[in-house]
């Protein structure tokens, strides 16, 4: 398939279409003029390299629009002035603005709880599966194994912290070198990125606001895969932060620290323990090709034991195992002998829900997978739908003034690393890179933070999650300190190297250009946010799984046409945006191809198909859930739920009417706005109140 | 309560083959080992060896090697010892006896089988 | 194999006596060392195992002592249902091994 969708009958004049394709302007222009220009304005753009920021797709199947999608809305203010209360009406103000901040926090509470809970399911379902992926012993050989492995792990275990530490105490136990470890490191830096394109999946039902939200997430995906890309050859050729690292801790005498602060978990432990507690040893012994381990539930029944040395009998191959000859007995069939032996003894059973079901992983898992799903998606809705209330206006214009605005010239370009040094200190509060950047998601979505700003926030969370965990390795126990410090400095040198690649020169922030072209195929296409989804962080890696276990000549044999014909794409690509008369006619554009290998137009057909038995449904489950939230927040009868329809939807894209898909967080000033009939508000039907 | 139940008395030829049997009760029967031993005016006790119902695993005296054959059926908790190629040495009181779990002291035996070769 | 020797193959005591059986390992067996009762026509019972414990429902009249190659089997206070057969055995190692035996007899 060629890269970008719907090449054939492109527009002939980029220029009318391609942002910077003849002038120099800001990446991030504001009709409104509410925010500055970002950091490292006015760069000289050429038509390649910002033509992957718009899917073609759009260019023919959609008019040619004069604001740029990637624009932030402006939030229009439709509530009263503050000036033009009574008394009453300024003390209710207050408490409404109380009541909003508190039912913010709850709804952000439960929100971070969810994701938690959410990591805990997916190791569940996926998490003896994932450490048996770790047991293979073909990591040792082969770096691309590990980067999958690392991949598959962390998509599975939804926390790339747990499948870090299989990896220490892996090589705390010489089962496998810091050589082999440092790929599946890489590896679970990629798949933690899953989790806030989950989150960004939420916000599907807003064309504009599921572009912004899907590119601000994926921008996170596209940073580590291109990092991975670069890096990993560089590491095997190299071997620079084995190296590297490996000479910081030689150079240090460590002492063991104290345990790395738990900041957010100390308030979202309480809730989260009393739903699921898990024993995240289980993992870990799987790994370890420990076969008792396999048969453990990961679920945790006793939370206070005791532990107790006693002197017990135990069987033993032969006498010479026996601790001293006076010692040793016989059964008749066997050998015993007395052993010190340790044993746990239960105290307490843990205080969750599953504790006395007894149901398996599975059931737990997949249990826990829904529920904690719909109350990640229904706190999002919440947050989302609160901020779209409070942010308007002034609060609006002051909120993202200060995320968005530079500093002034000539330390404009500080900004950035600003925003790097925030989105570190915020994970490292947090403990949870995936925690900061989900949290990030909902505010690209509603607009309040550009893509160009979030790229620096999550690449500061990628620093974050390593400082974290060179916390975590400096209070770790004398045997894995070594080896967990070298794995974390590591995750920490990758992730710095990844920045200096892709942040400092403008020219080469590739990842925000590629989200944003992805932001725009998946808002046309909605199915392909899905398909990324699954092809990026399952299929990939489960293929490179499959061929790396048959060997390195069927490794090669298939990777090689594959590698050779993608280059080929790109090459060709770039020819074709470049100096197309340079290629024969036929190469000048993608028809020599089958449709449906430069379009997604058949493939949307022939999805359209297969789920438009599901469409009524849905629309109408839609339809009463929007109508609840509207009585519950006291909306009058014009929130448009009936837009929930695609039929309903494609009757307003024939009348020319920019589309808002299915969304039950409507702010009816936005809608109205964007359909350019902003008035002024009346009493009866403002439903910007939450 | 615990009780190991033997037949009385075998009468059998010499060089044929006698296979007597040890019904349980009382306990489970897989959990303990079980114990043969013979017993002549002559010779005083001798361990001819012992099998774990649990697994059929048994263990055998170098002495009685390939003349007593030891099996269990766990269905009917019944223990059994094969006798082959009897000679008059092999007349004697057999017992069977329950081992005590992790050790070789036996807790409970049954009444004897006399096992009389004549011919 | 071990051997388990009962120097006395007879002892002869009245009731109330105290009777010491003495058994002899010819290597050392640790404490792995059972003592049993053989009434005539009866088949042998454990009074004690690990050399020095009762076995359920033994009178406390009965005491095993020793470790390593010797050991001693008392009777406290011989009573007339106690005329019997005693023997040791050993589970140090295979094959397991019992001593000839000691007969008590009244006075």
């Known amino acids: 398939m060629a890269p970008w969708p719907e090449l054939g009958d492109a527009q002939p004049n980029p220029s009318k279409y391609l942002e910077g394709a003849t002038s120099q302007q800001p990446i991030t222009p504001d009709k409104s003029k509410e925010t500055n220009k970002t950091d490292n304005t006015e760069v000289p753009v050429t038509k390649f390299e910002l033509l992957p920021t718009y899917s073609t797709a759009t260019l023919i199947e959609e008019p040619t629009e004069v604001d740029d999608p990637w624009n932030l809305p402006t939030l229009q203010d439709s509530g009263i002035k503050w000036s033009e209360r009574d008394a009453k009406g300024k003390i209710l103000c207050v408490f409404q603005g109380i009541g909003r901040l508190i039912l913010l926090l709850g709804f952000l509470y439960f929100f971070v709880c969810s994701l938690d809970v959410l990591s805990s399911a997916f190791q569940l379902v996926g998490g003896k599966m994932a450490g048996q992926f770790f047991s293979n012993s073909s990591i040792m050989s082969n770096p691309l194994l590990g980067l999958v492995i690392g991949v598959l792990v962390t998509v599975f275990v939804q926390s790339s912290s747990t499948s870090t530490s299989i990896v220490v105490s892996m090589v705390a136990s010489s089962l496998l070198t810091v050589r082999a470890a440092i790929p599946i490191i890489m590896g679970a830096n990629i798949g933690t990125s899953i989790t806030n394109t989950i989150v960004a999946l939420m916000q599907v039902g807003d064309r504009s606001e599921f572009r912004r939200a899907f590119a601000g997430a994926t921008v996170h995906d596209f940073f580590n895969w291109l990092s991975v890309l670069v890096l990993l050859p560089v590491e095997v050729a190299t071997h620079y932060l084995e190296v590297v690292t490996q000479l910081i801790v030689e150079s240090f005498h460590f002492k063991n620290g104290e345990d790395a602060p738990d900041l957010l978990k100390v308030i979202t432990k309480p809730f989260t323990k009393l739903i699921v507690q898990l024993d995240k040893k289980v993992i870990s012994q799987i790994a370890m090709n420990d076969e008792t381990a396999k048969n453990k539930s990961l679920v945790k029944i006793w939370c206070k034991t005791f532990t107790n040395m006693t002197q017990m009998n135990v069987t033993v191959p032969s006498m010479a195992n026996c601790t001293s000859p006076s010692l040793c007995w016989t059964d008749g069939i066997q050998i015993w002998t007395m052993k010190n032996v340790t044993y746990k003894e239960n105290i307490a059973k843990c205080q969750h829900i599953f504790v006395n079901f007894h149901l398996p992983d599975l059931a737990v898992g997949i249990i826990l997978l829904i529920i904690s799903l719909l109350v990640l998606c229904g706190c999002l809705i919440m947050i989302v739908k609160i901020l779209g209330s409070v942010l308007k206006g002034q609060v609006a214009t002051v909120i993202k003034k200060t995320i968005n605005t530079d500093f002034p010239f000539p330390f404009a370009w500080l900004t950035g690393y600003l925003a790097i040094l925030v989105g570190a200190g915020m994970t490292f509060i947090v403990q949870s890179s995936s925690v900061f950047t989900s949290a990030l998601t909902p505010l690209i979505g509603i607009g309040v933070i550009t893509i160009e700003r979030a790229y620096p926030l999550t690449l500061g969370s990628n620093i974050g999650t390593t400082t974290t965990a060179i916390l975590a390795a400096l209070a770790s126990p004398g045997n894995t300190l070594r080896s967990s410090l070298q794995i974390a400095l590591c995750h920490f040198f990758f992730n710095i190297s990844g920045i200096l690649l892709w942040y400092p020169i403008p020219f080469t922030r590739l990842p925000i250009r590629m989200a944003k072209g992805l932001g725009n195929i998946s808002a046309k296409y909605r199915w392909f946010a899905i398909f990324y989804l699954i092809i990026f962080f399952f299929l990939i890696p489960l293929t490179v799984f499959g061929l790396s276990l048959a060997g390195w000549p069927v490794l090669v044999g298939v990777g090689v046409p594959v590698v050779f014909i993608i280059i080929l794409v790109l090459c060709l690509r770039l020819l074709q945006s470049r100096c197309p008369r340079v290629l024969p006619k036929k190469l000048q554009n993608w028809n020599f191809l089958p449709l449906c290998m430069h379009s997604l137009k058949p493939w949307d057909a022939v999805i359209s198909k297969f789920t438009g038995p599901f469409q009524m449904p849905c629309c109408c489950c839609c339809r009463v859930c929007c109508r609840v939230c509207c009585l519950l927040c006291g909306c009058p009868k014009c929130c448009r739920c009936s837009k929930c329809c695609q039929d309903l939807e494609e009757g307003q894209e024939a009348q020319g009417v920019p589309v808002k898909a299915p969304e039950t967080f409507d702010n009816i000033t936005i809608s109205r706005e964007a359909q350019g009939e902003v008035r002024a508000p009346d009493s009866k039907t403002e439903c910007t109140a939450l | 309560q615990v009780q190991l139940q033997q037949p009385g008395a075998e009468l059998v030829k010499p060089g044929a083959s006698v296979k007597m049997s040890c019904k349980t009760s009382g306990y489970t029967f897989t959990t303990n080992n079980m114990h043969w031993v013979k017993q002549t005016p002559g010779q005083g006790l001798e361990w001819i060896g012992a099998?774990?119902?649990?697994?059929?695993?048994?263990a055998y005296n170098q002495k009685f090697k390939g003349k007593a054959t030891l099996t269990a059926d766990k269905s009917s908790s019944t223990a059994y010892m094969q006798l082959s190629s009897l000679t008059s040495e092999a007349s004697a009181v057999y017992y069977c006896?329950?081992?005590?779990?992790?050790?070789?002291?036996?807790?409970?035996w049954g009444q004897g089988t006399s096992v009389i070769v004549s011919s | 194999d071990i051997v388990m020797t009962q120097s006395h193959k007879f002892m002869s005591r009245s009731v109330g006596d105290r009777v010491r059986i003495t058994c002899k390992a010819s290597?050392?067996?640790?404490?792995?060392v059972a003592w049993y009762q053989q009434k005539p026509g009866q088949s042998p019972k454990l009074l004690i195992y690990w050399a020095t414990t009762r076995h359920s429902g033994v009178p406390d009249r009965f005491t095993g002592s020793g470790s390593g190659t010797d050991f001693i089997f008392t009777i406290s206070n011989v009573q007339s249902e106690d005329l019997a057969d005693y023997f040791c055995?050993?589970?140090?190692?295979?094959?397991?091994?019992f001593g000839a035996g000691t007969k008590l007899e009244l006075k």
């Open positions: 099998i774990y119902p649990g697994s059929g695993a048994t």
């Open positions: 055995q050993q589970y140090s190692s295979n094959p397991l091994t």
């Open positions: 290597q050392d067996v640790g404490t792995a």
């Open positions: 006896a329950r081992g005590m779990y992790g050790h070789g002291a036996m807790d409970y």
